[in-house]
């Protein structure tokens, strides 16, 4: 357990469509140094859904403030999920790396599903 | 290796409440869940609720909603479970236990037993 | 909730005997279940998770297969020290439920 570990806690959450849904992600040490992401999907396919060093995602929203010193928390927040956005998602960590950074480890995943707005 | 260490056993009067305390070393205390599952005399487990510390907010089952609170305080590394309006059905062994590298109760308390009785 | 059945209740068995314990979800809890031993006194151990993964230290005749609903627990030659209550859990739905507990005791 001293190697760090990716903490998914939730295996599935359901969420309604137009709904905000929450994906929660921690880590149990800062060591190594890197930036996590979020995926959506495995394996060559899967989607970048956050980048936690660089890019512009509108939907998504961390849920701590990520550059808070000694945070843990990599949670984030997707808006308005449409039926679209089933799926598993999985928080990534990566180590720092020269030129790119390396993934270093995966969290379980947490498996997306969205139920039908109510009338 | 991670040890948890629970408060000692309790006798309380119906209606009264309980808190029971889980002081965890080693390890990382506040990425993990901590959860907590009581044992009534003679059956089977059953899951309260538990806690990320990391997250702050607790789930709960049903069953217990609005009498069980559990907490968790990181400068300390305990977590807590407080259960109210005891009754006599609520005599049982409360354990804690924390999740491991896969998200399983890993490691457990020793147990706490808790009597209610007039 | 999820409802987790175990079957059977009691199984009365002689040390060196092969252990088959069953353990069926209400609704699909895909590969995320947990088995656990506890014995009299003691606190329960985590033995398989994730429907076939050995946890730490735990001795090659436990293993544990299935997944969707259906899942079982075999432990291939009876150990004296085997003989205990074996509980599944699932951890895919909030609340998280255990089954009702399979005892497996001497004959």
């Known amino acids: 357990e001293d190697e760090l570990q990716v903490i998914q806690p939730e295996k599935s959450v359901s969420v309604a469509a137009g709904e905000s849904a929450t994906l929660r992600c921690a880590m149990t040490s800062l060591i190594p140094v890197g930036p996590i992401m979020w995926f959506r999907g495995a394996g060559a396919g899967r989607e970048l859904i956050y980048n936690q060093k660089e890019g512009h995602f509108p939907r998504v929203t961390t849920v701590s403030e990520l550059t808070k010193r000694n945070n843990l928390d990599f949670s984030i927040s997707i808006s308005n999920i449409t039926p679209a956005d089933a799926g598993t998602y999985y928080c990534v960590k990566f180590r720092k790396g020269s030129p790119d950074d390396v993934e270093f480890k995966s969290g379980a995943g947490t498996e997306l599903s969205v139920r039908a707005k109510p009338s | 290796q991670v040890q948890l260490v629970q408060s000692g056993a309790e006798v309380k009067k119906p209606g009264s409440s309980v808190k029971v305390s889980c002081k965890a070393s080693g390890g990382t205390f506040s990425s993990y869940a901590i959860s907590w599952v009581r044992q009534a005399p003679g059956q089977g487990l059953e899951w309260m609720g538990g806690?990320?510390?990391?997250?702050?907010?607790?789930n709960y089952a049903q069953k217990f909603q609005g009498r069980v609170t559990i907490t968790a305080d990181e400068s300390t590394s305990t977590a807590y479970m407080e259960l109210s309006s005891l009754r006599s059905e609520d005599t049982a062994v409360y354990y804690c236990?924390?999740?491991?590298?896969?998200?399983?109760?890993?490691?457990w308390g020793q147990g706490t037993l808790v009597t209610v009785s007039s | 909730e999820i409802v987790l059945t175990q079957s059977p209740a009691t199984l009365s068995l002689s040390p060196g005997e092969r252990a088959t314990l069953s353990c069926r979800a209400s609704q699909s809890v895909s590969s995320y279940l947990a088995w656990y031993q506890q014995k009299p006194g003691q606190a329960p151990r985590l033995l398989i998770y994730d429907a076939s993964n050995r946890a730490t230290g735990i001795p090659a005749r436990f293993s544990g297969s299935g997944s969707g609903t259906d899942f079982t627990l075999t432990i291939s030659s009876l150990e004296p020290e085997d003989f205990a209550v074996y509980y599944c859990q699932q951890p895919y739905n909030f609340p998280l439920t255990f089954g009702g507990g399979t005892k497996v005791e001497i004959k």
């Open positions: 236990a924390r999740d491991g590298s896969y998200s399983y109760a890993t490691y």
């Open positions: 806690i990320i510390p990391i997250f702050g907010t607790a």
